[in-house]
Interface confidence: low
């Protein structure tokens, strides 16, 4: 696993412990919380990042209307079960043996149950809608400039292939970024849209996961783009299964 050889750190994940104990004395980095080796040349999976976060000390519109099946992560942080590749396991449980099923970005997609709950497969989140509201500016941003800057950001900072940024919508002050990535489209080595969205979310909140890099300084034609609210909607390849009680609550 590549890492900065000179001081042995992980450029893409500061929630790691690194030491020169890899083959041939190479720098090897392990995620906090799980101890799993991570590839520092790409983004770390959201599951391992959440686990590391939980182990750390507690300190006619052009806009898209989210589908009725879209999920919002209302459950907040939890300490997830990850598989050996760092993906979320389909079933998650807390310390009181309450369990639920999650999608590939770790968001709950069923009612909560007990240890008998079955989650037969990890359902892929294939469409992510990132809904941002920017702070007031003198005028609206130019849509094509904004589109180009956000696509550049996802390509260069998060290493997400441009084909997975499906669209950028803008209706001042709301910006929507659509990420789409079907199972069949994702090749080996491709960054997952869920991981890219999570890094972006943390960047927007001023909690960058990158080692030693400055915070996110988003500018469109030199004008700072300051986000004051973020909502992320997750759409799964198979619609979630919640009881009617939840849907009518």
């Amino acid at each position: 696993h590549t890492a900065a050889q000179d001081n042995c750190t992980c450029p893409t994940n500061k929630m790691t412990v690194c030491s020169p104990d890899g083959p041939g004395g190479r720098c090897q980095c392990r995620a906090l919380g799980s101890g799993m080796a991570v590839d520092c040349s790409t983004l770390t999976s959201k599951c391992l990042l959440l686990k590391a976060r939980m182990s750390a000390p507690k300190n006619a519109r052009t806009l898209v209307r989210p589908s009725e099946h879209a999920l919002v992560d209302n459950d907040g942080l939890y300490d997830p079960d990850c598989d050996p590749e760092g993906r979320f396991k389909a079933r998650q449980c807390n310390q009181t043996s309450v369990c639920w099923c999650v999608n590939s970005v770790g968001v709950r997609r069923t009612d909560k149950g007990d240890l008998s709950l079955r989650c037969d497969e990890l359902v892929r989140t294939h469409h992510i809608l990132i809904d941002l509201r920017h702070r007031p500016t003198a005028g609206a941003f130019n849509h094509s400039d904004l589109d180009a800057e956000l696509r550049r950001l996802f390509r260069e900072r998060y290493r997400l292939h441009p084909k997975f940024v499906a669209a950028v919508h803008y209706e001042q002050p709301t910006i929507q970024i659509e990420l789409r990535q079907n199972t069949s489209q994702k090749a080996a080595g491709d960054v997952d849209i869920g991981d890219a969205a999570y890094y972006f979310e943390r960047d927007i909140k001023g909690e960058s996961l990158f080692q030693g890099r400055g915070g996110l300084d988003l500018r469109v034609r030199g004008e700072p783009l300051q986000v004051e609210r973020t909502l992320i909607y997750y759409l799964d390849e198979i619609p979630p299964k919640f009881s009617m009680k939840r849907l009518t609550a």
Epitope: D79, D83, R91
Partner: nanobody
Framework: EVQLVESGGGLVQPGGSLRLSCALS????????IGWFRQAPGKEREGVSC????????NYADSVKGRFTISRDNAKNTVYLQMNSLKPEDTGVYYC????????????????????WGQGTQVTVSS
């Protein structure tokens, strides 16, 4: 290389005892819940018992409750299954398996997909 190696199986008379061991190597064992499974000839593999990362939480199949005890020694990277009052229906190949867990206290469910499996050790209960 990740490995789970079972030992301690053998032939025992009904009412006798055996202690199975599962030695873990090649991974950060501190983060793995461990389960024991068994498979009798011609039958499906079934869960016997499982234990959390910390060892503070355990679970048992109804058929072995009160007779089997699971424990772990993280210092020795080993999980044990103490089997007392053995019955002929306990005969089968016993496997240990490891599941990567998000909590020290939650035990893996019997049916969950475990990540790594051992090769198994034969237990035969017969007079």
């Amino acid at each position: 290389e990740v490995q789970l190696v079972e030992s301690g199986g053998g032939l025992v008379q009904p009412g006798g005892s055996l202690r199975l061991s599962c030695a873990l190597s090649g991974f950060t064992k501190d983060y793995y819940g461990i389960g024991w499974f068994r498979q009798a000839p011609g039958k499906e593999r079934e869960g016997v018992s499982c234990i959390s990362v910390s060892g503070s939480s355990t679970n048992y199949a109804d058929s072995v409750k009160g007779r089997f005890t699971i424990s772990r020694d993280n210092a020795k990277n080993t999980v044990y299954l103490q089997m007392n009052s053995l019955k002929p229906e306990d005969t089968g190949v016993y496997y240990c398996a490891a599941a990567f867990m998000g909590s020290d206290y939650v035990v893996p469910e019997m049916s969950r997909e475990y990540d790594y499996w051992g090769q198994g050790t034969q237990v035969t209960v017969s007079s």
